[in-house]
């Protein structure tokens, strides 16, 4: 039975040309997480396994820092990257948990974080 | 020394699907990507997608998808492509080809291809 | 996707020369373009990554250079073996794209 729950950063926003951490956290499970997958839509943007470590998509390689932890960090943001992103667990026994952030980047200077996991 | 072998060419019939198989020896499978190639004549090499088997995360071309489905048998070392729906335009050479897992975007060792023919 | 142009689909040359096969990509790549060599067998081989980094076990007489949106793969001094079709490949965006591919022959 699937006992784990994910938390993330939720709805977050972000300045043009900024960078934002991207962050989930898998909770009330002992199972073992073996990767986690950060993918936007059907797109891979990286992959952290626990055996190989990381590995950065072509498409985002310039532009996406491994870290901290599992995260993500997204720099050089464009309003191209608003949307949704997902930060998949593959974990041994429970199986596969998926969170869920929305991310909005914003042309404005004023730019909020979501109520977790606040970046400073 | 590192070898992908193939399994031998298919002739196949309009809307029926086929399954190609990748034997990879020599390496550690988990470690690479297996990429998948097609090779029509006069239309060069075409990215259909790829594998990591120690996890069977997979990325597809658009063009591919839906089409295309990849899997793993870690047990033997083999990757598979099913490619289904097959029309006169799915004749050509297929290759797996295999990339290090991080950031090493080129396909070092490739298998001898795969020649399939679609025809009623 | 990006699109990778090999002006070029076939070259003919004489042993010993220096040949130079072209790409050119729809938009700047960055410097990230791998070359392959296919022989009339069908054996595809990594011969350069990175623009010009030469793969292990590849003669000397392979180099690769480039930037921007135009690459280019020299062979110094043309043997028999050379005989094949060459690729560029992109690795700045998914999905990965190829060249149409240089056919390399002996005069």
């Known amino acids: 039975m699937m006992t784990g729950t994910i938390e993330t950063t939720g709805n977050i926003s972000a300045e043009k040309g900024g960078s934002i951490i991207l962050q989930c956290h898998l909770s009330s499970t002992t199972a073992q997480v073996t990767q986690v997958n950060w993918e936007q839509q059907d797109q891979l943007l990286a992959i952290c396994n626990a055996d190989l470590g990381w590995h950065i998509s072509p498409s985002f390689k310039d532009r996406v820092a491994p870290g901290p932890g599992l995260g993500l960090t997204l720099q050089s943001l464009t309003v191209n990257d608003t949307g949704e992103y997902f930060c998949i667990y593959h974990t041994y026994p429970d199986g596969t948990y998926t969170g869920r952030i929305f991310l909005e980047v914003l042309e404005s200077s004023v730019a909020e974080h979501g109520a977790r996991f606040q970046i400073p | 020394q590192v070898q992908l072998q193939q399994s031998g060419g298919e002739l196949m019939k309009p809307g029926a699907s086929v399954k190609i198989s990748c034997k990879a020896t020599g390496y550690t499978f988990s470690n690479y990507w297996i990429e998948w190639v097609k090779q029509r004549p006069g239309h060069g090499l075409e990215w259909i997608g790829e594998i990591l088997p120690g996890s069977g995360s997979s990325y597809y071309n658009e063009k591919f998808k839906g089409r295309a489905t990849f899997t793993a048998d870690k047990s033997s070392n083999t990757a598979y492509m099913q490619l289904s729906s097959l029309t006169s335009e799915d004749s050509a050479v297929y290759y797996c080809a295999r990339q290090k897992y991080g950031n090493f975007y080129y396909f070092d060792f490739w298998g001898q291809g795969t020649t399939l023919t679609v025809s009623s | 996707a990006i699109q990778m142009t090999q002006t070029t689909s076939s070259l003919s040359a004489s042993l010993g020369d220096r040949v130079t096969i072209s790409c050119s990509a729809s938009q700047g790549i960055g410097n990230y373009l791998n070359w392959y060599q296919q022989k009339p067998d069908g054996t595809v081989k990594l011969l350069i990554y990175?623009?010009?980094s030469l793969h292990s076990g590849v003669p000397s007489r392979f180099s690769g250079s480039g930037s921007g949106t135009d690459y280019s793969l020299t062979i110094s001094d043309l043997e028999p073996e050379d005989i094949a079709t060459y690729y560029c490949h992109q690795y700045s965006k998914l999905p990965y794209t190829f060249g149409g591919g240089t056919k390399l022959e002996i005069k």
């Open positions: 990175y623009t010009s």
